[in-house]
Interface confidence: low
């Protein structure tokens, strides 16, 4: 209930997060024409990446464009990108769509298409579907770990939403273990409403709400989170527009003195911790 | 309309192999993804392989991972059905279909026969034991 008397101010917060967990990735691997099974291991810096702010990433799914180098090409025939003769390429032109800049030269892309050469990292990156089941799928099961300090300045006082009594293999759970601060992406999911299966191939924003109510009167204090979750981006976008969370990221190596990159589309889920509440003292 | 005509069933021993075509009528066939289906007396069709309209993506069935291979000609407007080391459960009636490209990333949806919008009149393949 809503104390009257009391002063309130917002909290103050800081969140630091470790995830933690092993994945075991099986998939289609292509050489020389031959395609095999490989297998991988990825382990939290396979998956993760460093976020500004209060924010942390798992990579569930990816598709990857290998042995690229700086050279020239013919572009992906997407729709619309197909030519006929060097007319339809305009040299010096980038197109937001293209992955390069037209030389003004129509070239065969295959046996049959024709498209625009462009200097590029080559090949260039085909429009490939995100994998189905999820390649990381398995990252269901990993934990984090969310270390949250808070401050009210207002009433000097500071807290942190680990106690020095708490269990380091604890997994939260809303009716048993609502303290514990470790948590199984796959039951953030549940708890969500969300299915981590079907989310994971796409990708997906998860929001990970902490609520602070303190009351910092010496006679009845209580000061402790109260962790509850939410899907943040908008599962019902259109499939053609975009949906889901992805970006793109680089593996640089040289092979024989030639400069080469891995270029790899990462699909994930973005966990953004929102710390919110307040403080109130006679 | 686009519309699809099978060919290349038959009757072929156990181990043998057959190689189904499915010819498109002229338009932009090369918009569309393609998929063959199978249906067996009494039972729902079922998927067996698809290719994307990029040509790029190819899916397969787990039953006949290894034994079948698709393959599209976008400038003959045809899908081909490699069938090899056929089986007598094999035997049924096959199906080509086309599923227009409505962009995103569909792939996992081509084994569904809701995202095909036209279909063939099915050739019949028969393996005998």
């Known amino acids: 209930s809503d104390k009257l008397y009391q002063r309130k101010e917002p909290v103050i917060s800081s969140v630091h997060t470790k995830v933690k967990g092993i994945a075991e990735v099986t998939e289609n691997v292509t050489e020389g024409g031959v395609t095999k099974l490989g297998h991988s291991i990825f382990d939290t810096a396979d998956y993760t990446f460093p976020l500004q702010g209060n924010s942390f990433f798992v990579m569930t799914n990816y598709v990857k464009s290998e042995g690229q180098v700086q050279t020239l090409c013919p572009e992906y025939p997407r729709r619309g990108a197909q030519c006929s003769s060097d007319r339809r390429c305009k040299k010096g032109w980038m197109d937001p769509q293209s992955k390069g800049i037209q030389t003004g030269r129509c070239v065969p892309y295959d046996k049959t298409r024709k498209t625009c050469e462009v200097s590029a990292w080559c090949p260039t990156e085909e429009e490939k579907e995100a994998p189905r089941p999820a390649l990381l799928r398995s990252a269901e099961n990993f934990t984090v770990l969310i270390k949250n300090n808070i401050h009210f300045p207002g009433h000097n006082y500071t807290t942190r939403n680990i106690l020095p009594t708490m269990n380091g293999s604890c997994t939260f759970h809303k009716t048993w273990d609502p303290q514990c601060s470790i948590f199984r992406l796959g039951d953030i999911f549940q708890e969500a409403g969300e299915n981590f299966t079907e989310v994971a191939v796409q990708g997906g924003i998860m929001g990970i709400e902490i609520y602070w109510d303190c009351n910092l009167d010496s006679w009845s204090h209580h000061c402790r989170p109260r962790y509850s979750f939410r899907r943040l981006d908008d599962k019902n976008t259109d499939e053609s527009f975009v949906p889901g969370y992805n970006f793109r990221y680089a593996k640089y190596y040289k092979e024989n003195n030639v400069e080469k990159r891995t270029l790899i589309k990462a699909f994930g889920i973005r966990f953004d911790i929102l710390v919110f509440g307040t403080g109130g003292k006679f | 309309e686009m519309q699809l005509v099978e060919s290349g069933g038959g009757l072929v021993q156990a181990g043998g192999s057959l190689r189904l075509s499915c010819a498109a009528s002229?338009?932009?066939?090369?918009?569309?993804?393609m998929g063959w289906f199978r249906q067996t007396p009494g039972k729902e069709r079922e998927f067996v392989a698809a290719?994307?309209?990029?040509?790029?993506?190819?899916y397969y069935a787990d039953s006949v991972k290894g034994r079948f291979t698709i393959s599209r000609d976008n400038a003959k407007n045809t899908v081909t059905l490699e069938m090899n080391s056929l089986k007598p459960e094999d035997t049924a009636v096959y199906y080509c279909?086309?599923?227009?490209?409505?962009?995103?990333?569909?792939?996992?949806?081509?084994?569904?026969?809701?995202?095909?919008?036209?279909w063939g009149q099915g050739t019949q393949v028969t393996v005998s034991s």
């Open positions: 279909a086309a599923g227009y490209y409505r962009g995103g990333y569909l792939g996992y949806r081509l084994t569904l026969e809701g995202s095909y919008d036209v």
């Open positions: 290719t994307s309209w990029s040509d790029i993506s190819t």
């Open positions: 002229p338009g932009t066939f090369s918009s569309f993804n």
